[in-house]
């Protein structure tokens, strides 16, 4: 599998309609709540919570502040915390406790704290529960948290150092948590944690599942440096812990490796950043997507690996242990458990085949099985991803979370669309293409390039955004600019599902998966845009430039797959001859003009599509070069003279579109200043007019005239 | 001892309807998924639907085949499963099953003995 | 839907010989909870059908051992080991891992 391409658009952040939300004096927004319901956005940030409309997240509608004490403070730098970052609250959980109240916990200075949140007064309750197990005492630590039917499972550290992992179950009736030892979690970084509710026809009964995501160091390879590992684990819910043996412990705990590799070559993804569960009607079973990067990440690599939940399901229910070995002078400190498995098998969900042999509960179980997955809570099968190989790698990137969206495209076609946030505020979305992976877009989401902590994915239908939160704020964008391809070409070779072409409306639409017909709309997921209606109207722009001048045609491609070349009377131009130069790639420069140089200059665009190639003319422009008397000045071109020597004139260009009615281009005021009209929102091919005033005087003005569509092309 | 007996089979004309019945005995009825399977003359056996127990709310999934023309219920104070087959076409004659959905790892572990449904002009 | 294949569709034999049906799904029928509910059923003449294994390879209560199933992901095999009389008949395998289940053609055991 080959590296990913570029992405085919990059949006700058002033190029699209970005909504943000940011407060002063608030930062790092790692936190993000969607109430889909209330379309209610939660956001937890440094020392306070805030509730915004979910359509429209600039409009804040509740916040409450929840502060560090000075004496807390105090205490929290005398034992070497920064009192600036470190000794503050940072709230690091934020779960749906019910449907008036969340469960929020934070930092709280190095002293883990809860407490509930009422959602109709915007008010802690004050009941400031131990948030120790449940949310990190560091900032700076990893963490993971969900919640399952009024608990709060966990994966964080237990105490002040951040040396003792945890998983835990924060249960009035039945608290459980992982062993200290090193099998069962050595140095995690926890990424992720979900529930997998039962199926209701498995013939199993089974119970419902909580799954976490982590990296960890290695106990299997033991190398000179430390190696690590990507993990997945998984608890049952219906778990109560042993009756002696692994008392107030799980009982099911078991962790297997996650496999993301290329295989055709050493590449080895093994440092878990961030998982996405999807669940979609049309799945019969849950994929979760999985963003890695390599351990040694000296080139910015990141790959993206998809998992059957029922692979991971599978090695847990069937697999093999692994058990650890004494063998001296050797790397493998684990190896593969061939001996015999007690009955009931170690770390299964309580089911009805169990039930059946009388073990309704984890405390009914047989000492020999929970001794045995105590000692062996790892597994010796690896879950290997969907196809065997990575569903994206990139070089020059790294990403930092994920979030998945399966859609249709018109043709029928489902699409799981990736959305990967990078650490320099960028946001990529990606879809594979017969095998291959097309980068539809880049959007900056963040102007200051830093990097996005949190990822959140809207998924009720019509209103469709991503929210993505870092430390300065929270971006909420669409989950495609339609809008912004200007003709049915660029809007077919986006290759963008959520978009198609309506020729009724000449314009890009977003397909809402919605009950609106489709009929009519061209949508070609193949990129081929010979499927486009014809131009019954091309335009080209006259320009009138002054002798000896020089003259920049514009030409305003948006796609970084594109070649842009120029053509004069048909023939290709040089642009590296000393007569032309481009600016910013795309611009044609033409130095020391002459009436030779007078004519037709084309701008077109090549791109390879599978394996077509699709050519465009992007913009098309007339230019007459004008020997012009020194001192007259022809009065039926109304040229106003401007500072000095320097000429400009009123300027008429008709819109592209064909109906709307001219607008100017430059306007000459009568004081002799030249003001600018405001600049439309630029398009897939815009083609602005540019006036390039030289020291040399000179002459340029500009229409625009149509051609037919046969001279078009 | 578990025990299913289908009734209600006979002849019918396309376009027409007929009650299916499988009466249950020797288990708790309100604790199993209960299914219904045909078998045309000759032919393989097709899986139409099922009904869930008490725990999942009584629930009904059906095959695309039957789907908006059969519907499947229960009675559960007498026990009795029905299929309420409308629309009838040629089709659909067939011998009609019921069978108890097991919860130890399988699915259909008990079957009634089949009731006869033809469907002719 | 899934779709199941059986071959071969009728299975001469001699008594006391192995028979062996294969069975092939057009997707993976391993269920979320990672078990795959393939099951497979006897069919005697003017009988209803008859559970002999379950989830691939475990043998219903009462089914003698000379029947085995074998297989993961998407292909699967019903071995008999000799063969006797009161095994003839049509043998079908199940997937009750997706909705809709849906079952093979069957594939008819009998005397060469």
């Known amino acids: 599998m080959a590296f990913a391409p570029i992405p085919r658009i990059t949006w700058e952040h002033r190029e699209v309609h970005l909504v943000q939300f940011h407060e002063p004096d608030i930062y790092n927004y790692s936190a993000l709540l969607l109430s889909e319901d209330k379309d209610t956005l939660y956001i937890g940030a440094r020392e306070a919570v805030f509730a915004v409309n979910a359509l429209n997240i600039s409009e804040k509608q509740h916040e409450v502040y929840w502060k560090v004490s000075e004496d807390k403070k105090a205490k929290c730098a005398e034992k070497g915390k920064s009192k600036q970052t470190e000794c503050l609250n940072y709230i690091r959980v934020l779960q749906p406790l019910s449907a008036t109240s969340l469960y929020v916990c934070g930092t709280n200075a190095f002293q883990p704290a809860c407490d509930h949140l009422n959602l109709t007064s915007f008010k802690f309750l004050g009941k400031n529960e131990d948030g120790k197990g449940r949310c990190p005492f560091d900032p700076a630590h990893s963490y993971t948290s969900v919640m399952v039917d009024g608990e709060l499972y966990s994966g964080t550290s237990y105490n002040f150092l951040g040396s003792e992992p945890i998983i835990s179950r924060n249960s009035s009736h039945s608290p459980l948590r992982t062993e200290y030892a090193i099998p069962w979690l050595n140095e995690p970084s926890f990424v992720f944690a979900d529930v997998i509710r039962k199926s209701p026809d498995s013939p199993d009964g089974e119970d419902d599942r909580v799954y976490f995501f982590f990296t960890e160091v290695s106990v299997e390879y033991e190398f000179v440096f430390r190696v690590l590992i990507p993990r997945i684990a998984r608890v049952c819910k219906g778990d109560q812990g042993g009756l002696r043996t692994l008392q107030k412990k799980w009982t099911s705990f078991l962790k297997a490796r996650l496999i993301c590799s290329r295989p055709d070559s050493g590449l080895v993804f093994n440092v878990l950043r961030d998982v996405f569960v999807l669940r979609s009607p049309g799945l019969k079973v849950p994929v979760f997507y999985a963003l890695f990067t390599p351990q040694l990440n000296n080139v910015g690599l990141s790959a993206v690996c998809a998992y059957n939940l029922s692979t991971a399901e599978e090695v847990f229910s069937h697999g093999k242990y692994m058990q650890s070995t004494t063998v001296e002078q050797s790397h493998t400190k684990w190896v593969r458990y061939n001996g015999p498995v007690p009955k009931p098998r170690p770390g299964a969900c309580i089911d009805s085949e169990a039930r059946a042999a009388n073990y309704t509960s984890s405390l009914n179980l047989p000492d020999k099985t929970l001794q045995f997955v105590k000692d062996h809570p790892l597994m010796d099968d690896s879950v290997t991803p969907i196809d065997n190989r990575p569903r994206l790698i990139k070089k020059d990137v790294n990403y930092t979370q994920i979030v998945v969206d399966r859609t249709q495209a018109l043709d029928g076609t489902v699409y799981d669309v990736m959305f990967v946030s990078t650490d320099r505020g960028a946001l990529h979305k990606a879809i594979s293409l017969e095998h291959a992976v097309h980068i539809i877009e880049e959007t900056q989401l963040f102007q200051d390039f830093e990097p996005v902590q949190t990822l959140l994915l809207s998924s009720k239908k019509g209103n469709r955004f991503v929210y993505a939160g870092s430390n300065s704020g929270v971006v909420q964008a669409p989950l495609a600019f339609c809008g912004k391809h200007g003709t049915c070409e660029d809007c077919v070779l986006a290759r963008d599902p959520y978009c198609a072409w309506s020729p009724p409306t000449a314009t890009c639409v977003a397909l809402h998966q919605t009950e609106s017909p489709s009929r009519g709309l061209i949508q070609e997921m193949s990129g081929d845009a010979s499927v486009c209606p014809d131009k019954s109207k091309g335009s080209y722009r006259q320009h009138f430039f002054k002798h000896g001048g020089t003259a920049e045609l514009k030409c305003s491609q948006k796609s970084n797959l594109a070649r842009v070349f120029w053509k004069f009377q048909n023939g290709v131009l040089k642009a590296e001859s000393p007569k032309y130069g481009l600016m910013g790639r795309k611009n044609l420069l033409i130095f020391n003009l002459s009436e030779g140089d007078s004519g037709v200059y084309q701008c077109l665009s090549e791109e390879r599509v599978k394996n077509k190639t699709v050519f465009q003319v992007v913009a098309k422009h007339v230019l007459e070069v004008k020997v012009v008397p020194k001192p007259v000045v022809a009065p039926t071109l109304s040229v106003v003279q401007t500072e000095g020597s320097r000429i400009a004139t009123k300027v008429l260009v008709a819109s592209t579109q064909g109906s709307s009615p001219p607008t100017p281009a430059v306007q000459a005021t009568s004081s002799g200043a030249i003001t600018l009209p405001p600049k439309p929102a630029p398009t897939g091919t815009s083609c602005e007019p540019k006036i390039v005033i030289n020291t040399v005087p000179q002459l340029h003005s500009e229409k625009t005239m149509y051609l037919k569509s046969s001279d078009n092309r | 001892e578990v025990k299913l007996v289908e009734s209600g089979g006979g002849l019918v004309q396309p376009g027409g309807s007929l009650s299916l019945s499988c009466a249950a005995s020797?288990?708790?009825?309100?604790?199993?998924?209960m299914s219904w399977v045909r078998q045309p003359p000759g032919k393989a056996l097709e899986w139409l639907g099922f009904?869930?127990?008490?725990?999942?709310?009584?629930?009904?999934e059906c095959s695309a085949s039957v789907k908006g023309r059969f519907t499947i219920s229960r009675d559960n104070s007498q026990n009795i499963l029905y299929l309420q087959m409308n629309a009838l076409r040629a089709e659909d004659s067939a011998t009609y099953y019921c069978?108890?959905?097991?919860?130890?790892?399988?699915?259909?572990?008990?079957w009634g003995q089949g009731t006869s449904v033809t469907v002719s002009s | 839907d899934v779709l199941m294949t059986q071959t071969p569709l009728s299975l001469p034999v001699s008594l006391g010989d192995q028979a062996s049906i294969s069975c092939r799904s057009s997707?993976?029928?391993?269920?979320?909870?990672?078990?795959?509910?393939l099951e497979w059923y006897l069919q005697k003449p003017g009988q209803s059908p008859k559970l002999l294994i379950y989830?691939?390879?475990n043998r219903f209560s009462g089914v003698p051992d000379r029947f085995s199933g074998s297989g993961s992901g998407t292909d699967f095999t019903l071995k008999i080991n000799r063969v006797e009389a009161e095994d003839l008949g049509v043998y079908y395998c199940?997937?009750?891992?997706?909705?809709?289940?849906?079952f093979g053609g069957g594939t008819k055991l009998e005397i060469k």
């Open positions: 997707q993976s029928i391993v269920h979320s909870n990672g078990n795959t509910y």
């Open positions: 989830k691939v390879s």
């Open positions: 199940f997937q009750g891992s997706h909705v809709p289940w849906t």
């Open positions: 069978a108890t959905y097991g919860r130890l790892g399988y699915t259909m572990d008990y």
């Open positions: 020797g288990f708790t009825f309100t604790d199993y998924y």
């Open positions: 009904i869930r127990n008490k725990a999942n709310g009584y629930t009904t």
